[in-house]
């Protein structure tokens, strides 16, 4: 970019230095160089001399015109050809930007991950603006009417300690940049309704050699929430189809879930939970692998989730977590 140039004149942009992408713009250059009546004025964009659409307005001023300017950023400067000077003389430079006003933020969502100490709020910012866009998150207590504001460039983590105005709040987001400002709808939240329980983790698996062999999955969470609903999904690693089991869970002790699985097959398990009746689920837990034995009983432990095989413990590949994505796009 262009900063701290010693100017011998002036460069300016119409309609503005920051403008809406796709507009027609004019860049003006006015020379003020001692003992120089410029023979010619030149414009450079990102260091490359422009050859077209330059109009001389008077002895000291020229205009460069761009139609449908689509570059998010450009560094412009202009020079003068002075008599008796071998080199062009720098007049001045300016960084210009094009972009869009912000869209109305929508899909405003706030959650509290248990034990995080924060309320995390996110929203759909809409299309890329290309220019510096700031967001102000407003949090207003419905009990005390007190309002707090938080400035951010993307999402926001708000300490739950700062939410002293009871349990019920309105949250909304203002988006602003040089080209405009928009405000989201208000989201009403109750702090007790937006808690996502502490992550559920599968710790080990064992297959018991009975008449019909059964696999027991051991899993737990550090949550203090009393009523928790969980889903566990499992499939053979070669399969594209998950089986899902639902559980109403009380995590005062390690959970044991029984499955009747095919012998000598590598399975993958995941679990996730939510506070019963609430809106938000945990993400699916890391992938937990367990290979069922041909006949011999086996145990797979979380500590041994890597591809080593031996006669006593049978253990399987490392967990890789679940798919997450921030890609924008249509639903489907």
């Amino acid at each position: 970019g262009i900063t701290n140039i010693n100017c011998s004149g002036h460069i300016w942009v119409e309609p503005a230095t920051i403008f809406k992408m796709g507009m027609n713009i004019s860049i003006y250059c006015q020379a003020a160089i001692k003992n120089c009546q410029p023979r010619k004025l030149h414009f450079y964009k990102n260091g490359i001399k422009e050859r077209f659409q330059i109009t001389r307005i008077n002895k000291t001023t020229a205009r460069l015109w761009y139609k449908n300017f689509l570059e998010p950023h450009a560094s412009m400067y202009c020079t003068a050809e002075c008599p008796k000077h071998f080199q062009e003389t720098l007049i001045c430079g300016k960084d210009i930007s094009s972009g869009y006003p912000p869209d109305i933020p929508d899909e405003v969502t706030c959650v509290i991950y248990e034990y995080s100490g924060n309320m995390t709020c996110t929203w759909n910012a809409g299309k890329l603006t290309y220019i510096d866009t700031k967001y102000v998150v407003h949090v207003k207590s419905l009990e005390t009417e007190e309002e707090q504001q938080y400035l951010t460039s993307s999402y926001i983590n708000i300490s739950t300690d700062s939410l002293q105005g009871g349990k019920k709040y309105l949250v909304w987001v203002q988006a602003a940049n040089a080209l405009g400002m928009e405000e989201s709808k208000q989201l009403q939240i109750h702090l007790d309704d937006i808690v996502i329980p502490s992550a559920a983790v599968i710790s080990r698996a064992e297959t018991i050699n009975a008449t019909v062999p059964k696999t027991i999955i051991y899993w737990d969470s550090q949550t203090t929430i009393e009523k928790v609903s969980c889903e566990m999904r499992y499939k053979a690693t070669t399969n594209q189809t998950w089986n899902v089991k639902e559980f109403d869970t009380n995590f005062t002790y390690v959970q044991q879930s029984e499955f009747y699985l095919e012998p000598n097959i590598k399975y993958v398990f995941q679990v996730r939970c939510q506070e019963t009746g609430k809106r938000y689920w945990q993400p699916w837990s890391s992938l937990f692998f367990h290979k069922t034995p041909e006949t011999v009983p086996q145990v797979t432990s979380k500590a041994f989730q890597h591809d080593t095989w031996n006669s006593g413990l049978t253990v399987a590949s490392i967990s890789t977590g679940h798919l997450t994505s921030d890609n924008r796009g249509d639903i489907g």
Epitope: E107, T109, V111, Y113, T120, C121, T122, N124, A125, S154, Y155, N157, I196, K235, Q240, T241, W242, R279, Y280, W281, P283, H322, L323, T324, S325, D326, N327, R328, G329, D330, I331
Partner: nanobody, 122 residues
Framework: QVQLQESGGGSVQAGGSLRLSCAAS????????MSWYRQAPGKKREFVSA???????SYADSVKGRFTISQDKAKNTVYLQMNSLKPEDTAMYYC????????????????WGQGTQVTVSS
Amino acid sequence: QVQLQESGGGSVQAGGSLRLSCAASGYTYCSYDMSWYRQAPGKKREFVSAFNSDGTTSYADSVKGRFTISQDKAKNTVYLQMNSLKPEDTAMYYCKTDPHVQSSGGYCPPYWGQGTQVTVSS
């Protein structure tokens, strides 16, 4: 915002078939799995099936082998083909977007449809 519209419910004899559709409209920055849940009178809402964004599918044990979930990406629609229907499949069937947690730790809102009624008589 995302809107979900279910259709295809109705009354059918045991052993019969129905095909439910869930059409999603609207624009979102989130990654979603598309799920079907159901709720019978006096019972809690239960998971039925999902079409996951990684291309895998999920089924509850009670419907596995009888129900098939599929997706038409061009139409932003998820289908639930229900065969060999039983009286215990009688319920209101709801379509749901199941969001992934973002890398920021933030969350996208889940959306529910209004539901479509399925009645299976013996």
